[in-house]
């Protein structure tokens, strides 16, 4: 990616944070071995990565969760990467689904999402899951990031 | 990525290699449809990718494995992407976990890890797994790479 | 990635399309929140991404599928990222495998593939699966893309 004043590198990698909130939107923090290249990408309210410059971005998320078929709803565990652009409807960019494990007390599984998308100035991306209480927050298990092409 | 003498492309993609070693660190080779852009990234001792230049890198690994719940330990199969920097603690960058399958003789599963990290000159990244004997080495199943932003 | 006439950004992200064809090659479309940076990458016949310029590309695919162990063959569900270069044999770049779920009527699982590869002018990449009828085409579940470094 280009260096220099005109084309600074823009990249972020943030780390999952356990939350007492009941929202399905995952929470993130600048902790551990995080990346925040500069102020052209920011973590807002601990829940969304917001970019200042229009362009193509590779956006990714990884979610590790622990669930059990009997203790969970019939529906699978779904992780969604979503986009919020000024003056636009929110939209789903990417989703992944994993059926719950039969392992007890729960079985761990990992999901990885990633794709190239055009973002507008002020656009934000965030990650939704069906059940945040099942997400694993141990070192390296759940993270979220982007890089500008 | 920038071209030219100042900013050559730096990228690598290496292919898994079965090993008789008892170590949990996976072994890799420059074989098949591998990538090694230049000597600014090297595969050392068949186990780690080492970079010469500081900067932001997107680092990824994919591991396919075949395991059975009854024949394996209670603990899930875990793949870890780890970092070694001169004079620093080794650290876990990313991890993924999958509970063993009940399929017999074993059930195949694939894990993908990827994220953006700042690497120092001389830094090395490597992949650890809980049980290397369960890793699948068929064409394309298990690989490891990086690209400099 | 480089901007300017000499080094335009090259990137694509296409969305899965259900198909009545019996082929194992997945079908894609420029629909929804797709990306097609310019005519240096094109979607051909709805099945392959073709590039005009030689270089290193990060290529990725995500496939979500729903299968059941009893209703499926013994073999796992396999997704393969394949390369077709002018005057060359086709080759497998990446593969991932997931054993079928015991959930009924079927259990959803997601696979992610990604890696850095050198492509020649006119090279095409496509995605093969063992059973296209099991692939999930809901918003964001199955996608395919690349970006030139």
């Amino acid at each position: 990616m280009q260096k220099g004043d005109q084309n600074p590198q823009i990249a972020a990698h943030v780390i999952s944070e356990a939350s007492s909130k009941t929202t399905s939107v995952l929470q993130w923090a600048e902790k551990g071995y995080y990346t925040m290249s500069n102020n052209l990408v920011t973590l807002e309210n601990g829940k969304q990565l917001t970019v200042k410059r229009q362009g193509l971005y590779y956006i990714y998320a990884q979610v590790t969760f622990c669930s059990n078929r009997e203790a969970s709803s019939q529906a699978p565990f779904i992780a969604s990467l979503c986009l919020k652009s000024p003056g636009r409807f929110e939209r789903i960019l990417l989703r992944a689904a994993n059926t719950h494990s039969s392992a007890k007390p729960c079985g761990q599984q990992s999901i990885h999402l990633g794709g190239v998308f055009e973002l507008q100035p002020g656009a934000s991306v965030f990650v939704n899951v069906t059940d945040p209480s099942q997400v694993s927050h141990g070192t390296g298990f759940t993270s979220f990031g982007l890089l500008k092409l | 990525m920038q071209k030219g003498d100042q900013n050559p492309q730096i990228a690598a993609h290496v292919i898994s290699e079965a090993s008789s070693k008892t170590t949990s660190v996976l072994q890799w080779a420059e074989k098949g449809y591998y990538t090694m852009s230049n000597n600014l990234v090297t595969l050392e001792n068949g186990k780690q990718l080492t970079v010469k230049r500081q900067g932001l890198y997107y680092i990824y690994a994919q591991v396919t494995f075949c395991s059975n719940r009854e024949a394996s330990s209670q603990a899930p199969f875990i793949a870890s992407l780890c970092l070694k920097s001169p004079g620093r603690f080794e650290r876990i960058l990313l991890r993924a976990a999958n509970t063993h399958s009940s399929a017999k003789p074993c059930g195949q599963q694939s894990i993908h890890l990827g994220g953006v990290f700042e690497l120092q000159p001389g830094a090395s990244v490597f992949v650890n797994v809980t049980d290397p004997s369960q890793v699948s080495h068929g064409t394309g199943f298990t690989s490891f790479g990086l690209l400099k932003l | 990635m480089q901007k300017g006439d000499q080094n335009p950004q090259i990137a694509a992200h296409v969305i899965s399309e259900a198909s009545s064809k019996t082929t194992s090659v997945l079908q894609w479309a420029e629909k929804g929140y797709y990306t097609m940076s310019n005519n240096l990458v094109t979607l051909e016949n709805g099945k392959q991404l073709t590039v005009k310029r030689q270089g290193l590309y990060y290529i990725y695919a995500q496939v979500t599928f729903c299968s059941n162990r009893e209703a499926s063959s013994q073999a796992p569900f396999i997704a393969s990222l394949c390369l077709k270069s002018p005057g060359r044999f086709e080759r497998i770049l990446l593969r991932a495998a997931n054993t079928h779920s015991s959930a009924k009527p079927c259990g959803q699982q997601s696979i992610h593939l990604g890696g850095v590869f050198e492509l020649q002018p006119g090279a095409s990449v496509f995605v093969n699966v063992t059973d296209p009828s099991q692939v999930s085409h809901g918003t964001g579940f199955t996608s395919f893309g690349l970006l030139k470094l």
Partner: nanobody, 123 residues
């Protein structure tokens, strides 16, 4: 800044065991990780083991895997290195180090260091 004090070094025969301790003054809550490095005469300081405070995950140098075990007791603000099956090549000064929180990948945070404790493995 955290003050670190090591203890437990000494002379031991090959095949023997030692347990090193590293006591931290102040709160462990400001520490992201604690671990051990070692420096043999005429060699560079090398990583031995680390434990991360967020979930107790550990990593070891290849040369000590299966022989050394790192642990921490947060209530005592202390990290330990249990060293078994010691070999002459384990002879070195062992240093405890602590990495502060908030050390992102884009900055090389300064570690806090102990003064070191000598381990000699010889018959």
């Amino acid at each position: 800044e955290v003050q670190l004090v090591e203890s437990g070094g000494g002379l031991v025969q090959p095949g023997g065991s030692l347990r090193l301790s590293c006591a931290a003054s102040g709160s462990m809550s400001s520490i992201n990780a604690m671990g051990w490095f070692r420096q043999a005469p005429g060699k560079e300081r090398e990583f031995v083991a680390v434990i991360y405070s967020s979930d107790g995950s550990t990593l070891y140098a290849d040369s000590v895997k299966g022989r050394f075990t790192i642990s921490a007791d947060n209530s005592k603000n202390t990290a330990y290195l249990q060293m078994n099956s010691l070999k002459p090549e384990d002879t070195a000064v062992y240093y405890c180090a602590a990495e502060p929180y908030g050390s992102g990948s884009s900055l090389i945070s300064e570690y806090d260091w102990g003064q070191g404790t000598l381990v000699t493995v010889s018959s």
